[in-house]
């Protein structure tokens, strides 16, 4: 069964800056990744970035840099300033569309006990939805 993992980290140098990393643990070919915050995409969440493996990347403030880290994982840097900046308990979600598995989404937030610059290891987050 495919899984999606989400890791959220607050940068030590900028306390309002976050790095979100997401990965897909499956054998299928990824066709699209959507990163959102405030809840799952399409369920109250706001899209931060959409990444296509070949067509390109689209991102919106406060996202600063979205990129592919590997063929099955992405990262997104958020810079916080003003009303749209993330806070420590913000939920971030990543949705991977793949063939033939379908769409898989998981969410995560900053570990409550983590110090700036530290984060929990990138273990698979609970899968919220699998649209096959």
């Amino acid at each position: 069964t495919p899984e999606v993992w989400v890791q959220v980290r607050m940068e030590a140098t900028e306390l309002s800056s976050f790095t979100i990393r997401c990965g897909f643990l499956g054998s299928g070919s990824i066709s699209l990744v959507t990163v959102s915050w405030g809840g799952p995409n399409g369920a109250g969440g706001t899209t931060l970035a959409v990444l296509h493996p070949e067509r390109g990347i689209r991102q919106w403030a406060p996202a600063r840099q979205a990129r592919w880290e590997t063929q099955s994982s992405i990262s997104l840097i958020l810079e916080g300033s003003g009303a749209s900046s993330p806070c420590a308990n913000t939920t971030f979600c990543c949705k991977f569309a793949s063939f033939p598995e379908g769409s898989w989404e998981a969410c995560g937030s900053l570990p409550p006990s983590s110090d700036p610059g530290l984060s929990a290891p990138p273990t698979p987050a609970p899968i919220l939805r699998a649209d096959l």
Epitope: V50, G56, E69
Partner: antibody, heavy 114, light 113 residues
């Protein structure tokens, strides 16, 4: 199949504004950005910016900040671009596009002339 | 901004012959993470909007004839039409899809010799 249908040609006076519409059908309107591209007569293609209809998040080409303003209405699946303080140099065909420029509207000719 | 430069500006090729258009970017369009090049090619005929032909430097958009092919990596890319047809007469544009703002080449006008 996504279809983008734009509003008709406009003739405007210098200093005025114009609002171009782009109505989408056949796809998920709020999931992907609507891009706006300008093509002056006999010239190449120039990206103006984009709007993500679901959240009204925008990105603008620095060159067009203050000139173009994007809005979107998810209830009618329509994106809008307003161009202000029009000058003769703004005479061009304006295109909307979606899904990484895979789908295009037919274009809207805006002519600025006194 | 990434500057896209196409060559030649215009090109005349006989029907059935090969047409080659080059595109050079001022910065690499290769995403090191997934080893994909974010470059697209478009065809524009008079009075029509551009049509996406190639994305990811070499992937044909659905419905595009297989005589169109794209190649290259990093900063140097090529669009090839293996056997020119009359309906291929158009202006062709390359585009940076790697970073904001998306920028286009100045265009290459392809005609029949």
């Amino acid at each position: 199949e996504v279809q983008l249908v734009q509003s008709g040609a406009e003739v405007k006076k210098p200093g005025s504004s114009v609002k171009v519409s782009c109505k989408a059908s056949g796809g998920t309107f709020s999931s992907f950005s609507i891009e706006w591209v300008r093509q002056a007569p006999g010239q190449g293609l120039e990206w103006i910016g984009e709007i993500l209809p679901g959240s009204n998040s925008t990105n603008y080409n620095e060159k067009f900040k203050g000139k173009a303003t994007f809005t979107a209405d998810t209830s009618t699946n329509t994106a809008y671009m307003e161009l202000s303080s029009l000058r003769s140099e703004d005479t061009a065909v304006y295109y909307c596009s979606s899904y990484w420029f895979a789908y295009w509207g037919q274009g809207t000719l805006v002519t600025v002339s006194s | 901004d990434i500057v896209m430069t196409q060559s030649p500006d215009s090109l005349a090729v006989s029907l059935g012959e090969r047409a080659t258009i080059n595109c050079k970017s001022s910065q690499s369009l290769l995403n090191s993470g997934n080893q994909k090049n974010y470059l697209a090619w478009y065809q524009q005929k008079p009075g029509q909007p551009p049509k996406l032909l190639i994305y990811g430097a070499s992937t044909r958009e659905s419905g595009v004839p297989d005589r169109f092919s794209g190649s290259g990596s990093g900063t140097d890319f090529t669009l090839t039409i293996s056997s020119l047809q009359a309906e291929d007469v158009a202006v062709y544009y390359c585009q940076n899809a790697h970073s904001y703002p998306p920028t286009f080449g100045q265009g290459t006008k392809l005609e029949i010799k």
